[in-house]
Interface confidence: medium
Amino acid sequence: TQHGIRLPLRSGLGGAPLGLRLPRETDEEPEEPGRRGSFVEMVDNLRGKSGQGYYVEMTVGSPPQTLNILVDTGSSNFAVGAAPHPFLHRYYQRQLSSTYRDLRKGVYVPYTQGKWEGELGTDLVSIPHGPNVTVRANIAAITESDKFFINGSNWEGILGLAYAEIARPDDSLEPFFDSLVKQTHVPNLFSLQLCGAGFPLNQSEVLASVGGSMIIGGIDHSLYTGSLWYTPIRREWYYEVIIVRVEINGQDLKMDCKEYNYDKSIVDSGTTNLRLPKKVFEAAVKSIKAASSTEKFPDGFWLGEQLVCWQAGTTPWNIFPVISLYLMGEVTNQSFRITILPQQYLRPVEDVATSQDDCYKFAISQSSTGTVMGAVIMEGFYVVFDRARKRIGFAVSACHVHDEFRTAAVEGPFVTLDMEDCGYNIPQTDESTLMTGRA
């Protein structure tokens, strides 16, 4: 998937210092064998940079070649740079790996924003700050690309964590996580804690900082507060979910809930913004504008063209509303809500003209491919991708940026009827196209 514009990454505020977190084993859910134990080696294993994605260190081949790999729940290919490129400090050198096997097959992946193409093969792969296992996985060795790698981003490949249905060139190419689960005793589950900084970071700050955690095979209780609430994965392609209600500062948008999921709603770590279908976006902006009407902002701000800036340290967070998305619950007629703050949906950026102020981009944007719950949403929460039980869990992240008055929230249960009607049934055409233009 396209790496788009992403949020700044850092240990964040409001939680225990990241380096001091220890998982609590005592209150692991007892009915989930194999997910118990210490994940301390995986905590803080993500890094990243403003607008350029969260990445994890992986090794490929024998002897192991270390690469930084973008974590993307909106695609399903494991693809790495395998040829010199001006934006890559290093790349996968297949000829140096004694365990590389060529599949004698090419792969071509176009995005709205550029493309990559390469050659398919398999090799041994491991995650140093992950489970202590090595798996043979499919790898797309990227030999040619256009506007895919980002100058200074510090990652050399992409780890698509979604399902085989959207893998390229077709669904017969087993994604990495499927291979991992099949070949090892790692439970079919991973969880992500993405930590936004709340302000722009320069290159050295990024390299010295933490972007969050990807816990493979389990749930680390130190990464969240309160309870985990689960929503069903509607269909295993993207991580598709169903939104049943949207509120701005507690005011219902009062739209037919099908509109919220037109033509799908997905959870995607490879997209920065909260992206909303056109009608929903327009209603949400109207409501956010009304709620924040004590200050007037240029229309260009709401459309993503202009920044809004305040004197350093004076951002009036309190004038902006909270946004709640109600998700279908696991029990019939039961939903729960996740609530994000302006600290999540106002993305800190450097004004290219001046750096004296605190400047922000409105990180909610219009979509023609349905709702995308990108980093704007994920940075508020610890998100559990429970593939084994076909569900996604949300809890308040221990590292989300907030202030003394409000915090992100996950609350329930709420009674919501006819939630199944909220899902949109996509006409059966070719659905193998990757989602593109993922700001």
Partner: antibody, heavy 120, light 108 residues
Framework: QVQLVQSGAEVKKPGSSVKVSCKAS????????ISWVRQAPGQGLEWMGS????????NYAQKFQGRVTITADESTSTAYMELSSLRSEDTAVYYC?????????????WGQGTMVTVSS | EIVMTQSPATLSVSPGERATLSCRAS??????LAWYQQKPGQAPRLLIY???TRATGIPARFSGSGSGTEFTLTISSLQSEDFAVYYC??????????FGGGTKVEIK
């Protein structure tokens, strides 16, 4: 240094359409906005609409709504402006210009302009 | 839509003299205003944004002031290359991002 290079002059018949291209080079294309501005002979500047390529959605001035379509192809870093149902008063120089990355959304880089003549 | 009115339509000034151009908005645009310079046969060039900030490479003799509805572009000492048409543009409420009608600065 960002540059915007536009397609060449066009002569069109009334009632037909014209599609002008604007190719960006030397900088980021996707997350900036591309606006289209026209200038009739001896007249002032008139803003027609804009698009942020990465979002793919365009905004248009009411005057041109339904007659103009602004699109962008990120793979080639090119924006397009198509104007349909042309009439003689659409004879003008059409400019593309870039904005974004700042508080004010000013048009800081301009294309060289494309002369469109509508004549029977 | 917001209407931008520039005055005068034409300003005759001698080289070395000061030129003051005015731009009025039909409703408040805060400091969301830009000034552009256009010479015959050329594309416009950004001079001032945020009502008073000079764009990169613009000489110090150009200055902008004002906020709300009244704005001024001042050229402190006109050089021969400054004779051109100047446009203001509001960047507050849009679409459309309206331009003023322009002020032509000519040699007296």
């Amino acid at each position: 240094q960002v540059q915007l290079v536009q397609s060449g002059a066009e002569v069109k018949k009334p009632g037909s359409s014209v599609k002008v291209s604007c190719k960006a080079s030397g900088g980021t294309f996707s997350s900036y906005a591309i606006s289209w501005v026209r200038q009739a002979p001896g007249q002032g500047l008139e803003w027609m609409g804009s698009i942020i390529p990465i979002f793919g959605t365009a905004n248009y001035a009411q005057k041109f709504q339904g007659r103009v379509t602004i699109t962008a192809d990120e793979s080639t870093s090119t924006a397009y402006m198509e104007l349909s149902s042309l009439r003689s008063e659409d004879t003008a120089v059409y400019y593309c210009a870039r904005s974004g990355g700042t508080k004010y959304g000013m048009l800081d880089v301009w294309g060289q302009g494309t002369m469109v003549t509508v004549s029977s | 839509e917001i209407v931008m009115t520039q005055s005068p339509a034409t300003l005759s000034v001698s080289p070395g003299e000061r030129a003051t151009l005015s731009c009025r908005a039909s409703q408040s645009v805060g400091s969301n205003l830009a000034w552009y310079q256009q010479k015959p046969g050329q594309a416009p060039r950004l001079l001032i944004y945020g009502a008073s900030t000079r764009a990169t490479g613009i000489p110090a003799r150009f200055s902008g002031s004002g906020s709300g509805t009244e704005f001024t572009l001042t050229i402190s000492s006109l050089q021969s290359e400054d004779f051109a048409v100047y446009y203001c543009q509001q960047l507050y409420t849009w679409p459309p991002r309206t331009f003023g009608g322009g002020t032509k600065v000519e040699i007296k």
